[in-house]
Amino acid sequence: QKPSIGKCSVDIQQNRTKTTERPDLLNCPIYWQQVQEKCLLFSHTVNPWNNSLADCSTKESSLLLIQDKDELTRTQNLIHDKAISFWIGLNFSLSEKNWKWINGSFLSSNDLKITGDAKENSCVYISQTSVYSEYCSTEMKWICQKELTLVRNKVSPDSWL
Amino acid sequence: QKPSIGKCSVDIQQNRTKTTERPDLLNCPIYWQQVQEKCLLFSHTVNPWNNSLADCSTKESSLLLIQDKDELTRTQNLIHDKAISFWIGLNFSLSEKNWKWINGSFLSSNDLKITGDAKENSCVYISQTSVYSEYCSTEMKWICQKELTLVRNKVSPDSWL
């Protein structure tokens, strides 16, 4: 499989799985934009939620995870057309009867306010002004994220945790 | 969300989304092991296939994509218990009536030989000796991958392709 746009490009050397030499500067790839400590890719084309998840994954990234209202607002400010919607990494877990981020954490009640049904096959998208649920099979744009963390050169393994 | 294991660690600077300063050395993160030009993470816990896909994605990686029989053998050689199975990034696409990798390519007939049903909600796992299909809702361990590509220092955006 050819690496897709947005890989971390590196020089291969053997026998270095546990060393911790790290670069002190890494930029967002072409087509991605830096927003605070993340690189975001706003897709132009559309996909069902599952395909969007897979697309971000094969780009070695994640569907957008939103930490708080400030991050939601920052992201929404980058959406320049109020008619456009983007899948994020949040869907309804039927077994747990709760909204669940793809990293396994549950939506906390004071985070996003979701308009729409909380039921099986419901996934969450954001627009310029709101957060909605919709059937996961609906085709929409999506947002992938890569997190950037602050380090300089030699770092302890804790930087990976 | 706290950055999960396996992020690209960087020094944040603004206004540099299109520059292409790249590190010339990047190692597999702690807990990951280098196998040829990939870093692999063998999970310890278990998950349904969809959750495994999501987990790899939030680690900014992909469920394992296997290019050929050699890579399959190399990966299986790392499985030290014949009773343990790992989800990979391959499932059955009902609409396309074919086994499909999560990067969108179809399983070629001379690649892996899958034992088990090719039907809706069938996902693929590997063991020490074989490749099987199973209901995607079954909880199993899984393997995430990050690809490493060869570059040195200043590079053109082509290194991202």
Epitope: S4, I5, I30, Y31, L41, S43, H44, T45, V46, N47, P48, N51, A54, D55, T58, K59, E139, W142, C144 | K18, S93, E96, K100, W101, N103, G104, S105, P157, L161
Partner: antibody, heavy 121, light 107 residues
């Protein structure tokens, strides 16, 4: 080999129909939105239509809206363009094109060789 | 729809010359611009994407610049194989639109 191969072009009378096909190989066809682009003899490039990777969303240039239908069969790695009510001004070489990245509609890094459609009585 | 205006429509130049082609969008498109080269009887070939990124395999004598509404394709030292027609294309919004083309001819 990574390639796109169009077929189905030919001579057709005004008001007639043709169905173009584009067979893809060597890449993960089902993850890419795909487009048709045409070029009238001696003229420039004109985007005609696009379809999402899963096939549920389609777009058309105003000049062909209501007459052309784009579709795809991901199980066959094939893109189609059904052209009805053809006019003389639809005469062109028709190319299918793949975008550089699976998140994009455009920036076409792979083109077919093209198939010529001639509309004439 | 976003209109893309290319200039000049044709240019005569010699091998070794520096050639500059401009493309103007009728509204801002950030850096969502690509450049293609087309030779007679052949399909277009992607040269530049995202306004300034060189496509894999394209010689470094080709470069792109600009953002917003004004963009430039530069061939630093024209080679015999560069005589062709060049098109810009915006990828900011649908419908995708192309410039009218610039034919680079031998002087």
């Amino acid at each position: 080999e990574v390639q796109l191969l169009e077929s189905g072009g030919g001579l057709v009378q005004p008001g007639g129909s043709l169905r173009l096909s584009c067979a893809a190989s060597g890449f993960a066809f089902s993850t890419y939105a795909m487009s048709w682009v045409r070029q009238a003899p001696g003229k420039g490039l004109e985007w005609v239509s696009a379809i999402s990777a899963a096939g549920g969303t389609t777009y058309y240039a105003d000049s062909v809206k209501g007459r052309f239908t784009i579709s795809r069969d991901n199980s066959k790695n094939t893109l189609y363009l059904q052209m009805n009510s053809l006019r003389a001004e639809d005469t062109a070489v028709y190319y299918c094109a793949k975008p550089l990245d699976s998140s994009l509609w455009a920036d076409f890094d792979l083109w077919g060789r093209g198939t010529l459609v001639t509309v004439s009585s | 729809d976003i209109q893309m205006t290319q200039s000049p429509s044709s240019v005569s130049a010699s091998v070794g010359d520096r050639v500059t082609i401009t493309c103007r969008a009728s509204q801002g498109i950030d850096s969502w611009l690509a450049w293609y080269q087309q030779k007679p009887g052949k399909a277009p070939k992607l040269l530049i994407y995202a306004a300034s990124s060189l496509q894999s395999g394209v010689p470094s004598r080709f470069s792109g610049s600009g953002s917003g509404t004004d963009f430039t394709l530069t061939i630093s030292s024209l080679q015999p194989e560069d005589f062709a027609t060049y098109y810009c294309q915006q990828a900011s919004v649908l419908p995708i639109t192309f410039g009218g083309g610039t034919k680079v001819e031998i002087k």
